[in-house]
């Protein structure tokens, strides 16, 4: 059977200070049931950088209309990037759990790298 | 054009067990989750179960009683139901369930039920 | 568990008139919400996901509104093939996912 495969097709993207970085994941099925979120880092000390269903993220908007039927693109574009942003982001599937979601599966990672402004 | 197609419901005495299935068609049957939806006679809708991969979820009423399971090879969709109650009467739907945005289930196609009949 | 109240529980129409049906959340569910049509022996059809968006083939007369725990189905001009039960769902917070107990629509 075809397990869910979380996809992030790029390594590392390199984006100057100041524009907009736009990291790209793909799922290969809608199961198992869960949400879709987006961390940089890894471990514990992870920073939660996108979560649809709850939580204010005003720098970062999805590629895909949050209205799109049985969407597989998860990928996401943060806005005024800043030196403070570099680091690797984890697109991670959960798998519905009560009370708590549990981590199923997570992408491989891209490496953000932030360039100076041009002058 | 999706399918769905409900067999397996009748008339079975309290504490009978009885199953389900629900053969689809017309779509990729292994990425989507799948739920049964009953409605007693004259009444409204009441969810199920639901199945993802092998995640599996039950409505209080019927959990630990009936289980949800699928065969992607043979595209179907089942429902076993054991210990069955008077109040388990009702026509069973399987239901194809739909993902929006990134997290969130609702059912857009419908087969048209079977009935089962829990009597003594 | 959510529970949903819709109102009224009867509505009495005529064709051509305007209808709307409440369905009310006892929390709040952001719009994570969707409308059935049900015609009497027949199975749930799919009207309204996302509290506002129409399912494909949905005539335009159809439309949703509403977020957190007031939600609002309207049919402009009702057409006779409109008659039936109409129910509403949630799937922000399960298990479980659940129901209105429906709105029924009459001719009058």
């Known amino acids: 059977e075809d397990e869910l495969q979380v996809i992030q097709p790029e390594k590392s993207v390199s984006v100057a200070a100041g524009e907009s970085a736009t990291l790209r994941c793909a799922m290969t099925s809608l199961i198992p049931v869960g949400p879709i979120m987006w961390f940089r880092g890894a471990g514990a000390g992870r920073e939660l950088i996108y979560n649809q269903k709850e939580g204010h993220f005003p720098r970062v908007t999805t590629v895909s209309e949050l209205t799109k039927r049985n969407n597989l693109d998860f990928s996401i574009s943060i806005s005024n990037i800043t030196p403070a942003d570099a680091g690797t982001y984890y697109c991670v599937k959960f798998r519905k759990g009560s009370p708590d979601d549990v981590e199923f599966k997570s992408g491989a990672g891209t490496e953000l790298s932030v360039r100076a402004k041009p002058s | 054009d999706v399918q769905l197609v409900e067999s397996g419901g009748g008339v079975v005495r309290p504490g009978e067990s009885l199953r389900l299935s629900c053969a689809a068609s017309?779509?990729?049957?292994?990425?989507?989750?799948m739920s049964w939806v009953r409605q007693a006679p004259g009444e409204g809708l009441e969810w199920v179960s639901t199945?993802?991969?092998?995640?599996?979820y039950y409505a209080d009423s019927v959990k630990g009683r009936f289980t949800i399971s699928r065969d992607n090879s043979k595209n179907t969709l089942y429902l076993q139901m054991n210990s069955l109650r008077a109040e388990d009467t009702a026509v069973y739907y399987c239901?194809?369930?739909?993902?929006?945005?990134?997290?969130?289930?609702?059912?857009?196609?419908w087969g048209l039920g079977t009935l089962v009949t829990v009597s003594s | 568990e959510i529970v949903l109240t819709q109102s009224p529980a009867t509505l009495s129409v005529s064709p051509g008139e305007r209808v709307t049906f409440s369905c009310r959340a006892s929390?709040?569910?952001?719009?994570?919400i969707a409308w059935y049509q049900q015609k009497p022996g027949q199975a749930p059809r799919l009207l309204i996901y996302?509290?506002?968006s129409r399912d494909t083939g949905i005539p335009d007369r159809f439309s949703g509104s509403g977020s957190g725990t007031d939600f609002t189905l309207t049919i402009s001009s009702l057409q006779s093939e409109d008659f039936g039960v109409y129910y509403c769902?949630?799937?922000?917070?399960?298990?479980?996912?659940?129901f209105g107990g429906g709105t029924k629509v009459e001719i009058k």
């Open positions: 239901a194809k369930d739909s993902t929006v945005g990134w997290s969130g289930d609702f059912f857009d196609y």
């Open positions: 017309g779509f990729s049957f292994s990425i989507y989750a």
């Open positions: 199945i993802g991969a092998d995640d599996t």
């Open positions: 929390q709040n569910v952001r719009s994570d």
């Open positions: 996302a509290a506002s």
């Open positions: 769902q949630q799937y922000y917070d399960w298990p479980p996912f659940t």
